[in-house]
């Protein structure tokens, strides 16, 4: 496989990882599928200082990160553990709101204007942040 | 100049098997997604699939999930379309066509002449 | 999947004419909207992509806006050269989709 040594154009180097924030909305599963068709993930929030990072760059407006529990337990998109990683959960969420009327809970994890996180609907057509390691080997699958 | 020229079209049985393939040239091949458009008279224009530009995302339409694979050689310029299984409703031209990522989506630009698959007993 | 319509399916114009072509998506989106135009025996081309911005290369005659689930393509004065079929694609969300076209021949 290739690795990626640089950033792409109009991303933004920070701490070994590219980030690409957008400025306009799509569902969760439509944002995550922009991102892994560019070879990267909706972002991972691993540290504090990584929140405040991402936080500076999206502004007070909600925004998708790669955080869902739409299959039961909370998940992050790229494997990292959700049980013993960082998290900045508003007070009292996440809720599973069912009270919205759109059908279902809220299965998918966003910034909210104040940086914290919230569950929502995934359909909600909400920015987002894709993220991709530096130095990490492709998966570029053997051709048969 | 961006130039992509597929091959490998022609008349297959149905439940028969066929490989086509993309020469890209002009561009950094691996920073770019690409993908398959079908055409038929019928149907019009179909999406079909879409690979990362590391080939490790792929993505299907349901029509073609679990009988097409979407692939590439980077080291050689090479998008490929392998098809198996094939049915008469996938008599189409093919186009392969590079996806460019501006504006939180993906734009198809520039195509490729297009080659002809035809399913047929 | 997200449907996409055209109207008209056709429409017969003369050189120097305004044209206005309306696509509409079956769920509303953003401006996440492409138009192709396509000569007989071609491929597509890319006119316009995120709904209103001009691809590089394509004449200023050429106009897209909308948001949501109404779109437009507007040739502003028809040439020669742009007697073709045109087409949306929805690129919101997999399967991204098209419209089944619209036919501009000469009046």
């Known amino acids: 496989g290739s690795e990626r040594t640089c950033c792409p154009v109009n991303w933004v180097e920070h701490e070994r990882s590219c980030y690409w924030f957008s400025r306009s909305g799509k569902a969760w599963a439509d944002a995550d599928n922009y991102c892994r068709l560019e070879d990267a993930h909706l972002v991972v929030v691993t540290s504090w200082e990584e929140q405040k990072f991402v936080q500076h760059h999206i502004g007070p407006v909600n925004t998708w990160m790669g955080l869902h529990d739409q299959n039961g337990p909370w998940k992050w998109v790229d494997g990292t553990d959700y049980e013993t990683g960082f998290k900045n959960w508003r007070p009292e969420q996440p809720d599973d709101w069912y009270g919205h009327g759109l059908g279902g809970g809220e299965d998918c994890a966003h910034f909210t204007d104040d940086g914290r996180w919230n569950d929502d609907v995934c359909q909600r057509p909400y920015r987002w942040v894709c993220e991709t390691e530096l130095d990490k080997a492709s998966q570029e699958p053997p051709l048969l | 100049e961006v130039q992509l020229l597929e091959s490998g079209g022609g008349l297959v049985q149905p439940g028969g098997s066929l490989r086509l393939s993309c020469a890209a040239s002009g561009f950094t091949f691996s920073s770019y997604a690409m993908t398959w458009v079908r055409q038929t008279p019928g149907k019009g224009l179909e999406w079909v699939s879409a690979?990362?530009?590391?080939?490790?995302?792929?993505f299907y339409a349901d029509s073609v999930k679990g009988r097409f694979t979407i692939s590439r050689d980077n080291s050689e310029n090479t998008l490929y379309l392998q098809m198996n299984s094939l049915r008469a409703e996938d008599t189409a031209v093919y186009y392969c066509?590079?996806?460019?990522?501006?504006?939180?989506?993906?734009?198809?630009?520039?195509w490729g002449q297009g080659t002809l698959v035809t399913v047929s007993s | 999947d997200i449907q996409m319509t055209q109207s008209p399916s056709s429409v017969s114009a003369s050189v120097g004419d305004r044209v206005t072509i309306t696509c509409r998506a079956s769920?509303?989106?953003?401006?996440?909207l492409a138009w192709f135009q396509q000569k007989p025996g071609k491929a597509p081309k890319l006119l316009i992509y995120?709904?209103?911005s001009l691809q590089d290369g394509v004449p200023s005659r050429f106009s897209g806006s909308g948001s949501g689930t109404d779109f437009t393509l507007t040739i502003s004065s028809l040439q020669p050269e742009d007697f073709a079929t045109y087409y949306c694609?929805?690129?919101?969300?997999?399967?991204?989709?098209f419209g089944p076209g619209t036919k501009v021949d000469i009046k």
């Open positions: 694609q929805q690129t919101n969300s997999f399967p991204f989709t």
């Open positions: 690979i990362s530009g590391s080939g490790g995302n792929s």
């Open positions: 066509a590079k996806a460019r990522a501006v504006a939180g989506s993906h734009w198809f630009d520039p």
């Open positions: 769920q509303g989106f953003s401006t996440w």
């Open positions: 995120a709904a209103s």
